[in-house]
Amino acid sequence: KSSNEATNITPKHNMKAFLDELKAENIKKFLYNFTQIPHLAGTEQNFQLAKQIQSQWKEFGLDSVELAHYDVLLSYPNKTHPNYISIINEDGNEIFNTSLFEPPPPGYENVSDIVPPFSAFSPQGMPEGDLVYVNYARTEDFFKLERDMKINCSGKIVIARYGKVFRGNKVKNAQLAGAKGVILYSDPADYFAPGVKSYPDGWNLPGGGVQRGNILNLNGAGDPLTPGYPANEYAYRRGIAEAVGLPSIPVHPIGYYDAQKLLEKMGGSAPPDSSWRGSLKVPYNVGPGFTGNFSTQKVKMHIHSTNEVTRIYNVIGTLRGAVEPDRYVILGGHRDSWVFGGIDPQSGAAVVHEIVRSFGTLKKEGWRPRRTILFASWDAEEFGLLGSTEWAEENSRLLQERGVAYINADSSIEGNYTLRVDCTPLMYSLVHNLTKELKSPDEGFEGKSLYESWTKKSPSPEFSGMPRISKLGSGNDFEVFFQRLGIASGRARYTKNWETNKFSGYPLYHSVYETYELVEKFYDPMFKYHLTVAQVRGGMVFELANSIVLPFDCRDYAVVLRKYADKIYSISMKHPQEMKTYSVSFDSLFSAVKNFTEIASKFSERLQDFDKSNPIVLRMMNDQLMFLERAFIDPLGLPDRPFYRHVIYAPSSHNKYAGESFPGIYDALFDIESKVDPSKAWGEVKRQIYVAAFTVQAAAETLSEVA
């Protein structure tokens, strides 16, 4: 079959026609439309937006657009019994209370249904006790507290600053330390860039601004009550006591104005070093408890949120492939927001909307992609990636057989400095080639390619003349596709300058101030960065769906496998005596990586030479490429994390947002010197090396000549 049987336009012209149809003005218009009211998961407003998007995608020309609903566990504050934190005196009188809501931004004073700041899935409770400041509540922060400073958090309420790691990891660490409550706050050191004004006069976080967010430790499970299976009409639901990933202690977020009032009274130990000090005018004493005159005062939490099984709605649009309709390229991003979603997610949803419109325009002119493209507007991402995970659980058999690639489309911007890409190594060459064809939107790079500005501003730490591409972690909707199902995945957005802006994420993340005006006034007035992200995301989807040979280069996987093997070996070699004592060898892993490299090289040679007019051989070669990512899946999953099944990559056990390479070996080696049974611990290291070596070897063999 001709690869262009569905059209008389050349593939090159198709891509150009697709990209030329994308318009910044449309993205701007869509963003405005999506951000005028809150679209919290499980609410009527978000259901109405789902139906609007369904209707518009149909108008744009997709073959079908369906709503896929699930009944999942969500969490909401009690409307009549608000959450807050107080300082109480010795008589139990509340002498200070934290704010009940954020001061609304100008023009939004009369908007109803703004959910007040809360930590989703916090249990109810009213713990009171002494405060301990735990810095970012990372694993290493608790090591410092417990091991070096001999401070016991048991029975204490801990206060941690947001940033560096996923908030759910902070809560898990606090629970393991024995805390009875957690207060999360945004420190200006992390959420206030010097020299920039607070919203509404700039893009910084005001003192009353608060970051919402879920505090689950799902490890890829999806709906906490139906792990592994879709939360459909006939689902069997676990009891709340058996639910996956729920926190066991009350948690609440506050802004830095309220944090000041709590932290300024702290006594006890001084901070261990300057890395524990933020930018507030307080001592950053660790505690426990308040100083001198205030030592009889305690902190009390009042948390009354409820967990409720609630219906959510994904929108799934289909553009059927002309040649390989049973091969799916998926573009997905979420629709639900904490409040207005000016950046997260609607800057992404607006881009997806424009990509759908452009594809629809081409389809109306008689064109079809070679492969089927699925477009998804996911629900309840903010509550634990629930919409995408439930849909993938429901369709897992189709996806594992037919899924070519997944491109994520959450926030298009987190800054306006340069491009940021995280993806499977299979997509490195696709991203490089595409960005060489796109124009840079950056000032000072007029007439230059996106590749050039990206490489200049964000150079690869390993390869000169190339841009940095990061590992996939989690915290977004690609998780189930990549980490559980082994579908090649990628994401792209515009980001900040990490060298000069060391705050975590963007300052107004998950606050009421994440509005349309934030984007239009301060981040991207011309919507040129949004357009560039649309070109990158859309261009990747176009190539993946339309190229005759899948644009995957397996040799790039070989390169990173060697790098990751070297890295994990060097970590293990910090314990040379134990490696000798317990006969720990990485020979099998290095041998497997060597074999993978040789086989990948030979496969690439065959890929250049085979007869592309033979549809059977073409399909066979493409299947080997498509199934390579799948070959890295271990059906048994990682230890204690059955839904993280990718052997090469997993979200870090210490930070869900970050990706870790050879995670099974890494976790087995982590803090191994403190293990009570070293023989058992090093035995697990050996087992994990075995699993990794076997998996790499098995993946290599999928690229061998089939007969």
Epitope: S99, P104, G208
Partner: antibody, heavy 121, light 106 residues
Amino acid sequence: EVKLQESGPGLVKPSQSLSLTCSVTGYSITSGYYWNWIRQFPGNKLEWMGSISFDGNNNYNPSLRNRISITRDTSKNQFFLKLNSVTTEDTATYYCAREGDYYGSSFFTYWGQGTLVTVSS
Amino acid sequence: DIVMTQSPASLSASVGETVTLTCGASENIYGALNWYQRKQGKSPQLLIYGATNLADGMSSRFSGSGSGRQYSLKISSLHPDDVATYYCQNVFRTYTFGGGTKLEIK
């Protein structure tokens, strides 16, 4: 432009209650910030008395806690000071002020023009 | 309460001179200190916040410094318009003001 204006009786008898109103224009007191009362004694010494936040929470100077109350009427965009059991020591110029914040450091950005209250029999 | 002590209580200087006002706290206030200027018959006006940050609309001739318990306000190239009483304010834990420094022109 944000404006604050104090009003209330200029003369109060000892042991009675002092009541003042601060009327705010140009900004809704429920939209943000903390709304404060500060007084200046005849010798020019300034004393912060207390505040009410945009969401109705109070914070008081511990030295006045037993006799101070700060309330508000959101429909009129006003907040009020009530000081019980006054003595001649409470004679002062009373200011209302809006508190701003930066990096968690509090400060008073907008002030009323002040109203003199004399406590005398 | 944290006690704020300003010195001198009053100061007379000539136009064009540089003057320094000091403010001491009875304990460490970690930079949580503001300076206000109050002209005769007017309400106080914010001058410096967070010990070192110049408030919007104020002349760059004013600068704040200090940490821990000791803070100072420097006024360079004195103008006749600078005649006022200057107050420091502690905003650590509770809010307390210094007694003020009255600045006059010789």
